[in-house]
Interface confidence: medium
């Protein structure tokens, strides 16, 4: 801790301005009043303080606000935010989206730090749910944000917020997360017509059940292979060759390149070879002609 020393004559700060960058750490401690700093926080970020000087300013704020900073100060922290620990941030009550944006801007271009993760957690918990504006903001700064949430956390996302989600925001989502997001997307986009609906729902299809894939196959959607490869294996397996052909349209030819990868590999193993042959792609590994195909789920139900 910086020891208390008297402020030299004529150096008492009357505003937060550039002259302070020439103050030594002990002079900042002695000559900058905490109340002055707090009421002029919006000026700090425009001044190129050193990291050591920022430590002194943080120390002054910590003394003034031992229970945590008020939002009027948090909003103007600027680069001082980088000095905050997750423990500091847990004391805050951040309710304004403008405050959140201001702090995310400071960390822009960097990985999500523990400080930012704590800040977002405090903000979302304070709001009670991930509303559209918050989601818009978070995904703009961190495209992978949505996929960093647990299925439980995603369950608090209202369907209306799904409109804000871009395809790249879902790139790192796993099937469990898409299982939660897909029904919300379905609900959000349900009033759109066929082609528009498919454009919007496409990114979420990794959480779609078989029945919905069958329904899509009747709508001439021409799903690309990248989307098909992200579908749930258990949802793809029951699809017939004809349904997959309709689902993929002209992209069906891409199945050949993916025949050794899931879900295509597993799907091929479930199809009759003569049905696969109708595609004319040379797909191999289907059930040979004359073999009996048992529906194991039906067999279990009967026994």
């Amino acid at each position: 801790e910086v020891e208390k020393t008297a402020c030299p004559s004529g150096k008492k700060a009357r505003e937060i301005d550039e002259s302070l960058i020439f103050y030594k750490k002990w002079e900042l401690e002695a000559c900058v009043d905490a109340a002055l700093l707090a009421t002029q926080m919006d000026r700090v970020n425009a001044i190129p303080f050193t990291y050591e000087q920022l430590d002194v300013l943080k120390h002054k704020l910590d003394e003034l606000y031992p229970q945590g900073y008020p939002e009027s100060v948090i909003q103007h922290l600027g680069y001082l935010f980088l000095k905050m620990s997750p423990e500091d941030i847990r004391k805050w009550n951040v309710t304004s989206l403008e405050t959140l944006k201001a702090l995310l801007e400071v960390n822009k271009g960097h990985e999500m730090s523990p400080q930012v993760a704590t800040l977002i957690d405090r903000f979302v918990k304070g709001r009670g749910q991930l509303d559209k504006d918050t989601l818009d903001t978070l995904t703009a700064f961190y495209p992978g944000y949505l996929c960093s949430l647990s299925p439980e956390e995603l369950s608090s996302v209202p369907p209306s917020s799904i409109w804000a989600v871009r395809p790249q925001d879902l790139d790192t989502c796993d099937p469990r997360q898409l299982d939660v997001l897909y029904p919300k997307a379905r609900l959000a986009f349900q009033n759109m017509n066929g082609s528009e609906y498919f454009v919007k729902i496409q990114s979420f299809l990794g959480g779609a059940p078989t029945e919905d894939l069958k329904a899509l196959s009747q709508q001439n959607v021409s799903m690309d292979l990248a989307t098909f490869m992200k579908l749930r294996t258990d949802a793809v397996l029951p699809l017939t060759v004809a349904e997959v052909q309709k689902l993929l349209g002209p992209h069906v030819e891409g199945l050949k390149a993916e025949e050794r990868h899931r879900p295509v590999r597993d799907w091929i193993l479930r199809q009759r070879q003569d049905d696969l042959d109708t595609l004319g792609l040379g797909l191999q590994g289907g059930i040979p002609n004359g073999y009996l195909v048992l529906d194991l789920s039906m067999q279990e139900a009967l026994s």
């Epitope: 009357r14 301005d17 707090a38 919006d42 425009a46 001044i47 031992p66 900073y69 939002e71 009027s72």
Partner: antibody, heavy 119, light 112 residues
Framework: QVQLQESGPGLVKPSQTLSLTCTVS??????????WSWIRQHPGKGLEWIGY???????YYNPSLKSRVTISVDTSKNQFSLKLSSVTAADTAVYYC???????????WGQGTLVTVSS | DIVMTQTPLSLSVAPGQPASISCQSS???????????LYWYLQKPGQPPQLLIY???NRFSGVPDRFSGSGSGTDFTLKISRVEAEDVGIYYC?????????FGQGTKLEIK
């Protein structure tokens, strides 16, 4: 709606200490980062800022009055107070309390109380 | 301390006519953060001052749009596009660039 109300004696003798209290209603004095201020207005004259306090007790005073001013706060009563020592006739004024927001917006004011310094 | 000087000190305007008040500071009120810390207050007869304009040109909530502020550096202006009877009182400019905050001496607006 936040309301502020000044109270205290309207007449103080020279060399004594002027004491005023401002009671805040309709909001907490320890609310989001607000500072609480005293401003005075000499009869027929302009406004002079005296100083401000945060609910934790941290203060900032106008250097011209600093040697004579003390501002204190009582969060349990939602009040803050002004003491001005060694008063003279030049301290006769209407004293206002006001809420100070970021960037120095004095957004809520009391109605003001006239203090006369006279023997 | 920063000294604030207002002109004119009094003004008499007919209802519906425009009014303009100038305020000059002894030092620039612009900070390197881009903000300029100049405020306008109106004190109606028998009342405390009320905030009209903050940071040169931003109207405070509930302030009619006939009030506008402009200026930069050391020279600032408050304009009332069409004066109404309720606008009478004393107008003060105030700076908070540097503590202590300081007020202009006031401009008294009367209705003709």
């Amino acid at each position: 709606q936040v309301q502020l109300q000044e109270s205290g004696p309207g007449l103080v003798k020279p060399s004594q200490t002027l004491s005023l209290t401002c009671t805040v209603s309709g909001g907490s004095i320890s609310g989001d980062g607000h500072f609480w201020s005293w401003i005075r207005q000499h009869p027929g004259k302009g406004l002079e800022w005296i100083g401000y306090i945060y609910y934790s007790g941290s203060t900032y005073y106008n250097p011209s009055l600093k040697s004579r001013v003390t501002i204190s706060v009582d969060t349990s009563k939602n009040q803050f107070s002004l003491k001005l020592s060694s008063v003279t006739a030049a301290d006769t004024a209407v004293y206002y309390c006001a809420r100070l927001r970021g960037g120095y917006k004095f957004d809520y004011w009391g109605q003001g109380t006239l203090v006369t310094v006279s023997s | 301390d920063i000294v604030m000087t207002q002109t004119p000190l009094s003004l008499s305007v007919a209802p519906g006519q425009p009014a303009s008040i100038s305020c000059q500071s002894s030092l620039s009120l612009q900070h390197s953060n881009g903000k300029t810390y100049l405020y306008w207050y109106l004190q109606k007869p028998g009342q405390p001052p009320q905030l009209l304009i903050y940071e040169v040109s931003n109207r405070f909530s509930g302030v009619p749009d006939r009030f506008s502020g402009s200026g930069s550096g050391t020279d600032f202006t408050l304009k009332i596009s069409r004066v109404e009877a309720e606008d009478v009182g004393i107008y003060y400019c105030m700076q908070s660039k540097q503590l202590p905050c300081s007020f202009g001496q006031g401009t008294k607006l009367e209705i003709k």
